[in-house]
């Protein structure tokens, strides 16, 4: 989804110092939607560098992005969520490379948010819950979410569970007893919008019980 | 201007195999996905697929799932529609078309007639 | 498969008058604001051409006595004022989900 050419014969003919990606967030300010991009080389000289989109708009052809250190980012309810938009790097008015985006495919989501797990000790299990505000949207409403957790001492054995609601129970079987575990949750849009993954949510941590150990409601540490 | 020029009309027997071109020009070939609609003689539209240029990849309505490939040659800004084991109701003037948006048909190619006769 | 039927089969009106042809559809075509409803004219010999995209947005280069409107599932294709080249086929298609269907097509001719 890049640039304009006239037949495909220059394809890849914009600079490769300007390659750039981006990223959309629908209602992320009340019915505002924003607009993130930002250079794919951090070592870029973006002095003189500015954004631009046009097409797919409401009531206006162009938007120009503000600058906010090394990202670009606008905020507007004035996108039109079907058809494509051109994205374009400018120095002044010249397009150095430009993008052609539909913005319902570069969905990424807030990032869920008050993570707990609480330990059933009749049911032998963990619930795990979490919340996210995609459930108070209009548009991005179905998502998809990654539930990762691991005992505290394997640094990279996540153990990874998909699930569309924001609910989940682990069996304690399954789980280390005595062991410290981190958990932490990310959403990606699963129903028509497309894109990416949220940030992850904050880490919450919780100890299991010795076997036979009663220890009731799993605390934070 | 931006244009879409499918091949020429086929006249295939039944069981044999076709393959329909789609030549884009006027705009950047892999910005826009291009997807083949079907029309039988004096009927509706129906959607067989689609291609994206910039990544190959596909999608099908699942009706013509295993009677459909779609492919593309950027290097030629072309998509291509084969159709295997040809029976008579796949007889129809086939269309490429390419997505503005999410999925909307903006422009649209002359048409391939295929016809199936022993 | 979401479901599109459209009515009427046929349209008889006069040079001048107003055309409207609608298109529901067996489930919400909509996501909020967002409706993924569209219309095509095809003549004969000719591949169909887009009117609107989005339920009511004109396409580039149609002209304006065509106009769109709908939600959800009930959506209306409206010429204003009837010209003797709207005489065509007209199709409504959904989008928000795979298969992409069309409606059955409203043939518009003449009074």
């Known amino acids: 989804e890049s640039g304009y050419a006239q037949n495909g014969d220059l394809e890849d003919a914009e600079l490769d110092d300007y390659s750039f990606s981006c990223y959309s967030q629908l209602e992320v300010n009340g019915s505002q939607h924003s607009l993130t991009c930002a250079f794919e080389d951090p070592d870029v000289n973006i002095t003189n560098l500015e954004f631009e989109i046009c097409g797919a708009l409401v009531e206006v052809k162009c938007l120009n992005f503000r600058k906010l250190q090394e990202i670009y980012f606008i905020e507007t309810k004035k996108f039109l969520l079907i058809g494509k938009s051109n994205i374009c790097v400018k120095v002044g008015e010249k397009s150095l490379t430009c993008k052609k985006i539909d913005l319902t495919t570069i969905v990424k989501p807030e990032a869920p948010f008050d993570l707990s797990v609480v330990y059933r000790e009749g049911a032998n299990d963990f619930v795990v819950t979490f919340n996210t505000s995609h459930l108070q949207k209009k548009y991005v409403k179905v998502l998809m979410h990654d539930v990762a957790y691991r005992q505290e001492k394997d640094e990279n054995k996540w153990t990874h569970v998909n699930l569309s609601s924001t609910k989940l129970t682990l069996l304690q079987r399954k789980l280390q007893p005595a062991a410290m575990y981190e958990i932490k949750v990310r959403s990606i849009p699963d129903h028509y919008f497309k894109g990416f993954w949220s940030e992850w949510s904050p880490s919450y941590y919780f100890r299991t019980p010795e076997i036979n150990n009663s220890s009731g409601e799993m605390d934070p540490i | 201007q931006v244009q879409l020029v499918q091949s020429g009309a086929e006249v295939k027997k039944p069981g044999a195999s076709v393959k329909v071109s789609c030549k884009a020009s006027g705009y950047r070939f892999t910005d826009y996905e291009l997807h083949w609609v079907k029309q039988a003689p004096g009927q509706g539209l129906e959607w067989i697929g689609g291609?994206?240029?910039?990544?190959?990849?596909?999608a099908y309505n699942q009706k013509f799932k295993g009677k459909v490939t779609l492919t593309s040659d950027r290097s030629t800004s072309t998509v291509y529609m084969e159709l295997s084991s040809l029976r008579s109701e796949d007889t129809a003037v086939y269309y490429c078309?390419?997505?503005?948006?999410?999925?909307?048909?903006?422009?649209w190619g002359q048409g391939t007639t295929v016809t199936v006769s022993s | 498969d979401i479901v599109l039927t459209q009515s009427p089969d046929s349209l008889a009106v006069s040079l001048g008058e107003r055309a409207t042809i609608n298109c529901r559809t067996s489930?919400?075509?909509?996501?909020?604001?967002?409706?993924?409803m569209h219309w095509y004219q095809q003549k004969p010999g000719q591949p169909p051409k887009l009117l609107i995209y989005?339920?009511?947005n004109l396409e580039s280069g149609v002209p304006d006595r065509f106009s769109g409107s709908g939600s959800e599932t009930d959506f209306t294709l409206t010429i204003s004022s009837l010209q003797a080249e709207d005489v065509a086929v007209y199709y409504c298609q959904q989008s928000i989900k795979d298969p992409y269907t069309f409606g059955g097509g409203t043939k518009v001719e003449i009074k």
């Open positions: 291609i994206d240029p910039k990544t190959g990849g596909t």
């Open positions: 078309a390419r997505s503005g948006g999410r999925w909307y048909f903006d422009v």
């Open positions: 989005g339920a009511s």
């Open positions: 489930e919400s075509v909509s996501i909020h604001l967002l409706h993924l």
